[in-house]
Amino acid sequence: ECGHISVSAPIVHLGDPITASCIIKQNCSHLDPEPQILWRLGAELQPGGRQQRLSDGTQESIITLPHLNHTQAFLSCCLNWGNSLQILDQVELRAGYPPAIPHNLSCLMNLTTSSLICQWEPGPETHLPTSFTLKSFKSRGNCQTQGDSILDCVPKDGQSHCCIPRKHLLLYQNMGIWVQAENALGTSMSPQLCLDPMDVVKLEPPMLRTMDPSPEAAPPQAGCLQLCWEPWQPGLHINQKCELRHKPQRGEASWALVGPLPLEALQYELCGLLPATAYTLQIRCIRWPLPGHWSDWSPSLELRTTERAPTVRLDTWWRQRQLDPRTVQLFWKPVPLEEDSGRIQGYVVSWRPSGQAGAILPLCNTTELSCTFHLPSEAQEVALVAYNSAGTSRPTPVVFSESRGPALTRLHAMARDPHSLWVGWEPPNPWPQGYVIEWGLGPPSASNSNKTWRMEQNGRATGFLLKENIRPFQLYEIIVTPLYQDTMGPSQHVYAYSQEMAPSHAPELHLKHIGKTWAQLEWVPEPPELGKSPLTHYTIFWTNAQNQSFSAILNASSRGFVLHGLEPASLYHIHLMAASQAGATNSTVLTLMTLTPEGSELH
């Protein structure tokens, strides 16, 4: 060994100075008599070494590094040897910080593993090997007086938690607990916790289960769930309070909390939920009223609430077949009575024969909003209900009676926009209870089965805006029937368009006779088209060679026209314009020439 380094301290605070000396022995004969000692930190040469020959002939170089800013580096003492640098000795330098005070020390008693688990935050990186030890002692009082020490708990490398096993614990008695952190630059200790392990017990949550339906128990009400829970075995005799949380599986709803519930309730009916909805539920518990920690939330239980019977009003309307008055077509519309009126699975129309107590004969069962059935000869009334798995709506009676009430008057209709029609009337006297308004395509496309209908509950209404199934350029038949206590009035009807179309083309002009100063024209009118309003008039236009224009307005029933006052032997351009309230259309242009003065008239 030719050289040897010694340092003031191999481990220092990061940024602190460090002094090192390197001594080269005299007996290294292969060296220069006056060798120059060089210093290297890591890969970098360090200037500032002060070299001297000592009395015993050895060479010494001393260097002070003003700031050691590397957390770990090798300091080497070297000599130039030929073209290369020869390392004589090297030492490892480390720099870092003393341990910060560990903070946020907390402990949980785990009754499953029968151990006290403590965890802490170690604080900022020290850059040095730092050991943590969980220290504790038993204490009779509030930890002011120290009892038996408990064996130190040393966490595995890199972990910031440690378990004190049951054999070192004394339950229902205080323990002093703290963490000690130690490295080459110092020692620090966390603030001491004083706790009874049972006061930091963390329970496991109960296991949620659905209640097995028992034959004698009433089924849950709509919007309710019946559930029960199995308490966690190790906590059977620990007083706890629990809370339940639930949310619908679908949608973005947040958890709703229910509690506190006593653990020993063991079963619970949760109400106020949406009917026929799948919910996710969880439960958690805490030792109470004594101190403790909340358990984690239990695994989820997924349950569906029962649905409620439909809560709807059924507006009804009926029609008899003209050829067979006992065949009735019944129509209805469900009107929700509450925000959540329940799912409707289907509808039943039934009849109860008089004198047969309890006997109900179904006439039809359907998912549609209408049905056709044969009305028994003695039946004057049927009942209609909506149903689902939870039950039926209140029955709606439908009475089949003659039209004995007064009729409404002055029924009229007008377009509001291309997709709506206003129908108005003068109410009869006395006021009806309401009206049924029906509408559908008028002739030739009219069909009883394709009519839309609405119930107007206000008997004082004088009109109704039809917004459903209204399209432009279609002729609609609108039928309004007044409804009275036990009867109805006669139906009235009116026809209307929500928007009419201009004529698609004007009739073709034909020349019938021509003379020197006149021309007789004729045309065949276009047949009326559905959705097109009737013609109001024609206008005939003619233009001479000098581009002078003339016109005449003719009524809609015209089939021809004679142009007078024409110039002989002159060219004329003529066209016909057919007009309705919805617009006008021009025919193609007819060009003709009047006869020369010496020519004979053409007929």
């Epitope: 009754l111 499953t112 029968s114 049951r166 054999k167 339950l171 049972m198 075995q233 190790p234 059977l236 005799h237 620990i238 007083n239 006593p262 020993e264 309730a265 063991l266 030792r287 009223p289 004594l290």
Partner: antibody
Framework: EVQLLESGGGLVQPGGSLRLSCAAS????????MGWVRQAPGKGLEWVSS????????PYADSVKGRFTISRDNSKNTLYLQMNSLRAEDTAVYYC???????????WGQGTLVTVSS | DIQMTQSPSSLSASVGDRVTITCRAS??????LNWYQQKPGKAPKLLIY???NLQNGVPSRFSGSGSGTDFTLTISSLQPEDFATYYC?????????FGGGTKVEIK
């Protein structure tokens, strides 16, 4: 200091009924499970029944199920054991006990003797 | 239900002896095992709870160990006042059965 005082024991004919009471003091009665343990003459200890702090959970030993009913009145700090259809094998000293959170019988009363004999 | 088997049912020992009583559960009960001492004509007294925790006021010569199904009560140096019957009891379930008892007598 915790004290438990049983009463209501005595001689009863087979098929008869008896109601034991246990008056508790020195602790917050409504926070603890309570229980009954019996000991037949010259025999070991036998757990009979226990009751949760608010009375919602009441497990029983198979030997007494359907015949005995445990109950409590937290306002009176009293535990009860209603014993019906008594049999000779129910003859024992009945102890009232306060349970700890980990299910141990923390404190015991002095016991009351029930003798079922014709 | 979890049954408890205690052994021996009786033993004779001298003052100063180390005495060991065992208790076996028919299935795992974690640490939910308690030991009681009963002297003739007296109510039982809790010695050890949760397998190894000494009840307040109980001398430190009594100790408990074990977990799962096998448990032990040890009296390190038997004293005259320790001659009594000892019972184990599980509290893992609602049905809290006792062992059959071990009678410790003077040799």
């Amino acid at each position: 200091e915790v004290q438990l005082l049983e009463s209501g024991g005595g001689l009863v004919q087979p098929g008869g009924s008896l109601r034991l009471s246990c008056a508790a003091s020195g602790f917050t009665f409504s926070l603890y499970w309570m229980g009954w343990v019996r000991q037949a003459p010259g025999k070991g200890l036998e757990w009979v029944s226990s009751i949760s702090s608010s009375g919602g959970v009441t497990p029983y030993a198979d030997s007494v199920k359907g015949r005995f009913t445990i109950s409590r009145d937290n306002s009176k700090n009293t535990l009860y054991l209603q014993m019906n259809s008594l049999r000779a094998e129910d003859t024992a000293v009945y102890y009232c006990a306060k349970l700890g959170e980990l299910g141990m019988f923390h404190k015991w009363g002095q016991g009351t003797l029930v003798t079922v004999s014709s | 239900d979890i049954q408890m088997t205690q052994s021996p049912s009786s033993l004779s020992a001298s003052v100063g002896d180390r005495v060991t009583i065992t208790c076996r559960a028919s299935q795992g009960i974690s640490s939910y095992l308690n030991w009681y001492q009963q002297k003739p004509g007296k109510a039982p007294k809790l010695l050890i709870y949760y397998a190894s925790n000494l009840q307040n006021g109980v001398p430190s010569r009594f100790s408990g160990s074990g977990s799962g199904t096998d448990f032990t009560l040890t009296i390190s140096s038997l004293q005259p006042e320790d001659f009594a019957t000892y019972y184990c009891q599980q509290s893992w379930e609602y049905a809290m059965f006792f062992g059959g008892g071990t009678k410790v007598e003077i040799k």
